[in-house]
Each structure stands twice: as C-alpha cells, then as structure tokens.
C-alpha cells in the first residue's frame, strides 16, 4: 500500500477555501522529490492541477498554492474560491503522477445553506464588525433604507433610516448613508454572535421599485491553535484582537462545561486561585495585544482556552476572542523538582532550578512573583554577578550541580520571603520553573554569632555549630560576594556543645582570619553540602574596625549583636514583565530533552508525600 | 468538562451493519476533530476514522482497513458523531471509543492511536462472529 496519507474525502461549500494536507514518509528523498496534486479523469489518467516545482495549471491560477515542509514530512494544498465544478476525485502523490506514490481525496463542493443568485457571502470572525454594502438606483436615494433577517420563513426588520434598531442588535448596529456620490447604503454590526449568522435582505424603498441585495453572513467560531507544552514547563498565550479593543478590559479563561469559560487572569485584577504563583499577563500594547504566561505546567492545566476583550473582563456573547488547545505532555524533558520548599526563619533554603542542559552557557536568572495587579516577576539575582541591593549577602546563585539544574541559596530567613519564585533562563523560554518557599516554625540548625566585629591587624576565629544530622556532610566557610561564595579553609573543632540531645557527632567548624585587613569585611556563610549538591547555610556579617586593645578575638554564640536593617529596595530594580518576557534575545525559543541527576537526600533535606512535591530546607 | 457517550455496539454476523454513536457534551467553542478509534484484546489501540471541522468545510480520514466500509459522520445540531460500519468482518470485533478535541485529525496524530486526545467515552463493544 502507498505510505501517502491524507483526507479520504473533503467537504466544503461553493466560495470557501479548502487546506489539504497530504502526509509521506519524511526520508531524504521523499523530501526533496515533486509533490504534486491532480484530478483524476473519466479514463484513469491524473492531471497535475499544481505541482512544487512550480506548475500552477490555468483553472488553479490566482487560487492555489502548495507549500512543502520537508521537517514534518507534510505538504498542504491550498484551494481558494471553490465551485461546485472543482467536486471530483483527486490525487496527491509524490514524484511522478503515474507512480504509486499517492493518495486519493474526494473533493466535493455543495452549492452551501440555500442562497440565492446574487448573495453576496460575509464570513467573518464571532466577536468581529462587518460591514454589508447595499447598492441602490437614484430613484430610491431618498427613500426608506431598511435590512431584514430572513428568520424561518419571515424576514423581520433589523434596522431601518428612520432610527428603528431591533432589540437584538441594540448598541452594536448602525446603519450609514454614503455621501450623495455613492449610491450605496451600509449596515455595520459589531459584537458578531453566533446567533447573527444567516440571511439578510437590504432594501432600499418600500414598493415594487424597490432595489433588494441578499446577503449570507456566516460567524465563524475561532480554530483553535494547538499548543503541545511539556508537564512542568511553561506556555504563552499571545492574544492580538486588534486596536479596536485597545482600551477594552482583556481576559484569558479555560473552558469548562458547556459554554462555560472560568477566567484564569484578567486586566481587572482577577486570577484564578489555581494559577497563583505561575502566571503572568504581560501588559498590553498600543494595539490592545497582550500575552499570558504559565509556568510549572499541571495536566490539569490541558484544556481549552480563550482569550478576549470585554468591560466586564470575562467572556460576553459578542467578545472578540481567540482560542487555543493545549495539550500537556507527560512525558516531559523537564525533569521533577520540588515546587514547595520550607525554611524556619533566620534559616535557609538551597532551591534547585531545572533549566535544558543543552544551553549551559545561558544566563540563569531568579526572580520574585508578586500577584498584584496582573503579576510581574522582578529579578533578584542572576548568573552574571547582579545581585539586587537588600539581597546583598544572603542570595547567592550557583551553577551547580551544571548539567540541567543551578542552584539557589537565600539565608537569613523571615516571614517575608514566603512567596512565589521563577527559575528561568535567557535560554528555552519553556523551562521556566515555579517554587513556592515556605516559612514554617522551628529553629535553624546551623548556630552562629550575629554580627561580629574584627580588629585590623588581628586575628578572628567565628564558629559554626553543626548538628549532628549534618555529620555525614562536608561542612564550609565562604565569604560572600555577588558572583558566589568563595571558600575559605576552616577548622573542625571537634563535637560542639550548643545542641542538647546531640551526640559526639555534633561538630564546632571555626573559620579563622588572620591578620584582618579592610578587605575582610563582608558576609560569611557557613553551609553543608553533599558533592556539588547544597543544603542549609548561616550567614555572619563581620565589620572590622581600628585596634582598641591588643589580642585575637574569639567570638562566641553569647556575644552575637543583632542582625543589621535589611537594606532598602534599590531604584534601579529589574524585572522579568513587560518586554522583558518577550524579548527574543532574552528567551530564544528552542526545544530540548534534559535529564538531571537525582539529589543525594540530604541535600534536599525532606521530600513531602502528597498533592506537591516539597523540599525542606530547616529541621521541622 | 467534556463527556462523551458512545451506544450502539452489539453482536452481528460477518456481512452485517452496525451504526456507532457518541454524543458530547460540554464546552462546544471550535471543536476541531473527533474521532473513532477501537482497542481488541491484547492488542494496542488503532485509528478508526476521523472527522475534522475547519468553518464550512468537513476532511475525513480513514485507517486502510475500513476503507470503503465504514463511514464516519458528524451532526452538529444534536452535538453526535456516528460510525456507520458495513460489511463487518470477523477482524472487527474489538472496543469501540469515541475521542474528541484532537489536536488535528490527520497523520501523526491519527497514526499515534489518539495518544494526544484529551477526551475520551467509556467504549461500546462490537463483535462479529463468522
């Protein structure tokens, strides 16, 4: 059998448009040989209507067209202005017509919903404005002007010049006289509902003078595009429903029973509890288009979605609207990492970022999702050394482990940084992934002073107290600086006495700085980690001041001074919204498989059974 | 959500007829292709037919092993597809299930026995006894 497959048979109506697509086998050959389309003969033989070498035959000429794509291992033929003359058998084939490359189509073209000679065919988009043209002879030029809808076997009035308007068409229909040149009158209806499709008479005059125009108005409802999205990973929806709705409140919702359409996120300020934390609706242009984003793909999140225009910011009848299938694929390349991870306050979290390994060399980045207004996503921290102003000193990012995932560390934890956050890259737009941080009761595990001060010239020794959980850890110091955490030698100070109920494998580890300069004031961290893998991390600031007395300094838990103000919001703050997020260059679109290797289990601490996969970054 | 109803399954002889329905309900904005697809035992679930919508204009597909005996056919008003199965063979017998809101009836997705359909009815059985 022929390995060409397509329609078996294709129904359309006189004046419509037809896209056939014909699927082959998608081998080096296959792809580069003609691709042709013919109709088949009373006598069995096949004339070529249109071929991709460039034949167009004379009935298909200013009508047709064949586009091959080789990648798909498809092409599509297009016909335009069908007639009932073009219902026949076809074939479309690859190579040689005579060949057996090739497929049979039924093409069969009906004279369409009963209209009568001269009607003139509207076909537009539900939600859009048409306009119906009206033609009349001088004789009628001050006569009444009137449109009917033939509704069963009567045509009731419409509109009319003498101002009457059918409640139907209330506040969406107006009727235009062209200047006395013009001998044509128009009718335009906004807000097309499905319901307006059918047949309509204009009239100019009242007698049997009177000249009629029929007219057939089919309202289309939107193709929905298909959208394919990986389990995990994110999707957007761009909406462009034209400058007309500019300053109209826009929406974007999921269809769930009936006609039913749940709003997932409008410029209103309403969003679906189910998208919080993972969607924003980027705001509009001049010319009323917008964009919708979702990260941490659900399959639950499959389904129907439409976007439009309305005052009341949901779908209306009459709402200009464009629609999308999503699909969600389960077997996704975006590999599992937790989406809840929990902190106590004044600990940590080390939060893992999936992003496609194959773009290890992207710019990884880190930002906060804020719910109000339509959501925005201001940037906190990326791979390139920024680091926003009151982040300073507890939010770093790593780009270990490499291979497909980075790594987020934020200390010094407080109520306030419970919320939302995006991984993303200026890679695969795709791979933008959603955590949620947690902030539940319970002491950090690492114990370390408050602020400590050295002395120029002398020497600082800081502990860090280390339960025994962590004995199986590699325990660290590093100063902080806005491009990582430097490591620094420490010593282990044998079992610690800071944890009641902790045996000998409790640990003090000490880091020790000699002969302190200007250069050593800044932030410390001491952490643990398993391989390149990070868990929790403590942060001192150390400030360092002129000799008052001679001596080395040990610093003790007891001596510990508060913690400094947090630092205020800098002004020149950045953010992933706006253009940012549809900026090519800063999310160019590529496709990739990645796999990540999985954490060694302390390193993520605990992994939740339940509804959301949750990393804890704090004893409990 | 979308539900889907399938009837008119049953026992026939080899040669005879037997017309399939599914009816849907649920969100009807664009519903771009249904389909028939039907799973015997230990085998992997195969194409039937599918029937595209794309505005005024219907593309049906068929799987080579029906061709010519099976017709499938939509009507919009009462929201049903239909699977009018002629001529059926032994080899018929199997599951029947209705699919809808595919993402484009034809090759690939036609080919990968409805992997990407997100709604499906419950089957009606079909055997054909020689």
């Known amino acids: 059998k022929s390995p060409i497959f397509g329609p078996e048979e294709v129904n359309s109506v006189e004046g419509n448009s037809v896209s056939i697509t014909c699927y082959y086998p998608p081998t080096s050959v296959n792809r580069h040989t003609r691709k042709y389309w013919c109709r088949q003969g009373a006598r069995g033989g096949c004339i070529t209507l249109i071929s991709s070498e460039g034949y167009v035959s004379s009935k298909y000429a200013g009508r047709a067209n064949l586009t091959n794509f080789p990648e798909n291992g498809t092409f599509v033929v297009n016909i335009a202005q069908l007639s009932q003359d073009d219902s026949g058998r076809y074939k479309c084939g690859l190579g040689i017509n005579s060949r057996g490359l090739s497929f049979d189509v039924s093409l069969e073209v009906s004279q369409g919903p009963g209209l009568l000679n001269d009607t003139k065919v509207y076909t537009v988009d539900l939600g859009r404005t048409v306009t119906i043209n009206c033609p009349f002879k001088t004789e009628n030029a001050q006569k009444r002007k009137s449109l009917y809808k033939q509704i069963g076997l009567y045509p009731v009035l419409v509109i009319d010049s003498s101002g009457y308007v059918n409640p139907n068409y209330t506040g969406r229909i107006r009727l235009d006289i062209q200047g006395t040149g013009q001998l044509l009158f128009s009718v335009v209806i906004n807000q097309l509902r499905l319901s307006d499709a059918g047949q309509y008479l204009c009239q100019a005059g009242d007698d049997s003078n009177s000249n009629k125009k029929n007219a057939d108005l089919q309202v289309l409802k939107p193709e929905p595009e298909l959208v394919y999205e990986d389990l995990r990973g994110s999707v957007t929806f761009h909406c462009a429903l034209g400058p007309e709705v500019a300053n109209v409140a826009k929406f974007l919702c999921r269809q769930s029973s009936g006609e039913n359409c749940d709003v997932v996120v409008n410029t209103l300020g309403k969003r679906a509890p189910a998208f919080e934390g993972r969607i924003l609706l980027n705001p509009q242009d001049k010319d009323g288009s917008f964009s919708v984003v979702i990260t941490g793909l659900r399959k639950e999140d499959a389904g129907r979605y439409l976007c439009g225009a309305h005052s009341d910011g949901q779908l209306q009848e009459g709402s200009p609207i464009q629609a999308w299938q999503l699909f969600v694929n389960e077997e996704s390349t975006i590999p599992r990492s937790p989406t809840v991870v929990k902190g106590v306050a004044g600990g940590s979290v080390a939060v893992l970022c999936p992003y496609n390994r194959k773009e290890s060399k992207s710019i990884k980045y880190w930002c906060l999702w804020e719910g109000a207004q339509n959501g925005r996503c201001p940037l906190l921290v990326d791979s390139e050394g920024w680091v926003k102003a009151q982040y300073e000193g507890r939010l770093s990012l790593l780009e270990e482990p490499g291979n497909g995932t980075f790594t987020v560390i934020l200390n010094q934890l407080t109520s306030r940084d419970a919320g939302f956050y995006w991984c993303l890259t200026n890679g695969d737009t795709l791979w933008r992934t959603t955590v949620e941080i947690k902030i539940i009761e319970g002491e950090p595990n690492l114990k370390v002073p408050g602020n400590v001060t050295a002395v120029l010239g002398e020497t600082l020794k800081v502990p860090c107290h280390f339960p025994c959980k962590f004995s199986s850890y590699e325990k660290y110091w590093c100063k902080w600086n806005n491009t990582g955490c430097q490591a620094l030698p420490s010593q282990d100070e044998g079992p610690s006495k800071a944890f009641v109920n902790c045996d000998e494998n409790s640990r003090l580890v000490s880091l020790t700085l000699n002969l302190v300069t200007r250069a050593d004031e800044g932030w410390y961290w001491c952490g643990v980690k398993q391989g390149h893998f990070y868990g929790e991390t403590a942060a001192v600031y150390v400030a360092v001041e002129e000799r008052k007395a001679a001596g080395s300094r040990d610093v003790s838990l007891a001596k510990a001074d508060a913690a400094p103000d947090e630092k205020v919001l800098d002004s020149g703050f950045r953010e992933i919204e706006n253009k940012a997020i549809q900026d090519p260059r800063l999310f160019a679109e590529e496709k990739a498989v990645a796999d990540t290797r999985d954490q060694a289990d302390g390193s993520r601490a605990s992994v939740d059974s339940g509804s959301s996969e949750e990393q804890g970054g704090s004893s409990r | 959500e979308v539900k889907l109803v399938e009837s008119g399954g049953g026992s026939v002889q080899a040669g005879g007829s037997l017309r399939l329905s599914c009816t849907a309900s649920?969100?009807?904005?664009?519903?771009?292709?249904m389909g028939w697809f039907r799973q015997a035992p230990g085998r992997e679930r195969e194409g039937v037919a599918t029937?595209?919508?794309?505005?005024?204009?219907?593309?049906?597909y068929y799987a080579d092993s029906v061709k010519g005996r099976f017709t499938i056919s939509q009507d919009d008003a009462k929201n049903t597809l239909y699977l009018q199965m002629n001529s059926l063979k032994p080899e018929d017998t199997a599951m029947y299930y209705c699919?809808?809101?595919?993402?484009?009836?034809?090759?690939?997705?036609?080919?990968?026995?409805?992997?990407?359909?997100?709604?499906w009815g419950q089957g009606t059985q079909v055997t054909v006894s020689s």
């Open positions: 649920g969100p009807t904005y664009g519903r771009t292709c």
């Open positions: 029937i595209e919508t794309k505005g005024l204009t219907r593309y049906t």
């Open positions: 699919a809808a809101d595919g993402p484009g009836c034809s090759g690939g997705a036609f080919i990968a026995r409805g992997r990407w359909y997100p709604h």
